[in-house]
């Protein structure tokens, strides 16, 4: 990696997570430089010979790209000039997890930064009232998780209560034999209460809320990626 710049430039990366089977982004920014023809971006992965991706002279140079990344990487070419060296990674695989380095050279100087990329599966939970059950119950389903997450229930009225005795959680392997469908049923629920189903692994935490009243059912769900 030849260096022509005289100074070190600031390069910033963000630990991020990839959802297997979907597209992901490895984030990297640097001090902007209007001289595009002088910008070189190199992405490397620890333990891998060859490059993940190289961008120089305004275009991709994939002559040294490792075969496991062939056809799966792209930079945001129109954003490079404003200091965006982030890498788009198509069809994220479990094996994409690891330590990546973002190397930058511009007419102002050079710099690099590492990032930890975690891979797994995570999805939004959906809670529904299970009218088929003998007593009124709630069914929380999330289609794709990996590694196997923990599932916990909470209630607005019974704060701090342990629902493990009145809930049942199962994990069903999906057809690709990696990710799993999460199903958790909470029994003996009471009306006019808000219940939360929380699914968490070391990559993400997802929460589904449901409020059941006499007249309506209100739902809300959110997903948060965990940085560490």
């Amino acid at each position: 990696f030849g260096i022509s710049g005289k100074h070190f430039i600031t390069v910033t990366t963000f630990t991020s997570a990839g959802n297997i089977g979907e597209d992901g982004t490895l984030s990297c920014t640097f001090e902007p430089d209007i001289k595009l023809n002088g910008i070189v971006i190199q992405w490397l992965k620890e333990g891998i010979k060859g490059l993940v991706h190289e961008f120089k002279e305004g275009k991709d140079d994939l002559s040294q790209q490792h075969e496991m990344f062939r056809g799966r990487t792209a930079v945001f070419a129109d954003q490079v000039v404003v200091g965006n060296a982030s890498l788009r990674l198509k069809n994220v695989q479990l094996t994409d997890a690891g330590t990546y380095t973002c190397y930058i050279r511009t007419s102002k100087g050079k710099g690099n930064a590492n990032l930890e990329y975690k891979t797994g599966a995570f999805s939004m939970p959906e809670i529904n009232v299970d009218y088929n059950a003998s007593s009124e119950s709630l069914r929380c389903e999330a289609p794709r998780w990996f590694p196997q997450p923990t599932v916990a229930w909470a209630s607005q009225v019974d704060q701090g209560a342990n629902f493990s005795e009145v809930s049942n959680t199962s994990f069903e392997l999906n057809s690709e034999n990696v990710t799993m469908k999460v199903v958790s049923v909470l029994y003996n629920v009471t009306i006019n209460n808000t219940y939360s189903c929380m699914i968490e692994n070391d990559i993400a935490k997802a929460t589904g809320d449901i409020k059941v009243t006499d007249s309506e059912v209100k739902r809300r769900s959110q997903l948060q990626l965990l940085n560490s």
Partner: antibody, heavy 117, light 107 residues
Framework: QLQLQESGPGLVKPSETLSLTCTVS??????????WSWIRQPPGKGLEWIGS???????YYNPSLKSRVTISVDTSKNQFSLKLSSVTAADTAVYYC?????????WGQGTMVIVSS | DIQMTQSPSSLSASVGDRVTITCRAS??????LNWYQQKPGKAPKLLIY???SLQSGVPSRFSGSGSGTDFTLTISSLQPEDFATYYC?????????FGGGTKVEIK
């Protein structure tokens, strides 16, 4: 949506300094990384890039004008400015401010500046 | 400086015609070529960026192609509102430079 508006005197005397301000509305000038730019167009002619500035203060000028140009930014006022010194009749043009990434996607409507005694 | 040469400098066409404008750079600019439309008394409007990406809100009859030194702007079916002057611009190496323009007039 984001809008840019040029302002400044429409008439400048030869050898004096042309001063224009671009006010950004509908968004913060420092909310993201952009090249806040000036472009000019003499009557009946083509477009010429004058220069650009980042909110960090880094400036980039057209070498043909560099000795006479100063571009500055005032984030507190959401404005950036152009100063062009020692003007001549050849500097008579419509002056545009614009926002750029690697393309100029938002433009002001332009202001005509005539250099004449 | 990178010189941008547009051709033709003007052309006459009718509504419904397919119109092609070319732009040549004096050296390779990869895909950092943008196209603008300008109507009299108005500011230029971005049509195409990165040689072929259509700017949001621009009709799909506009398309761009090319890389390196040779680029093309195509209007597949000219509409009355398309009569204007078109400029190419490179953002590969400062100073950013524009082509001389192509004026599209009514035949």
């Amino acid at each position: 949506q984001l809008q840019l508006q040029e302002s400044g005197p429409g008439l400048v005397k030869p050898s004096e300094t042309l001063s224009l301000t671009c006010t950004v509305s509908g968004g913060s000038i420092s909310s993201s990384v952009y090249y806040w730019s000036w472009i000019r167009q003499p009557p009946g002619k083509g477009l010429e890039w004058i220069g650009s500035i980042l909110v960090s203060g880094s400036t980039y000028y057209n070498p043909s004008l560099k000795s006479r140009v100063t571009i500055s930014v005032d984030t507190s006022k959401n404005q950036f400015s152009l100063k062009l010194s020692s003007v001549t009749a050849a500097d008579t043009a419509v002056y545009y401010c614009a926002r750029a990434v690697s393309f100029l996607d938002v433009w002001g409507q332009g202001t005509m500046v005539i250099v004449s005694s | 400086d990178i010189q941008m040469t547009q051709s033709p400098s003007s052309l006459s066409a009718s509504v419904g015609d397919r119109v092609t404008i070319t732009c040549r750079a004096s050296q390779s600019i990869s895909s950092y070529l943008n196209w603008y439309q300008q109507k009299p008394g108005k500011a230029p409007k971005l049509l195409i960026y990165g040689a072929s990406s259509l700017q949001s809100g621009v009709p799909s009859r506009f398309s761009g192609s090319g890389s390196g030194t040779d680029f093309t702007l195509t209007i597949s079916s000219l509409q009355p509102e398309d009569f204007a002057t078109y400029y190419c611009q490179q953002s590969y190496d400062p100073p950013w430079t524009f082509g001389g323009g192509t004026k599209v007039e009514i035949k």
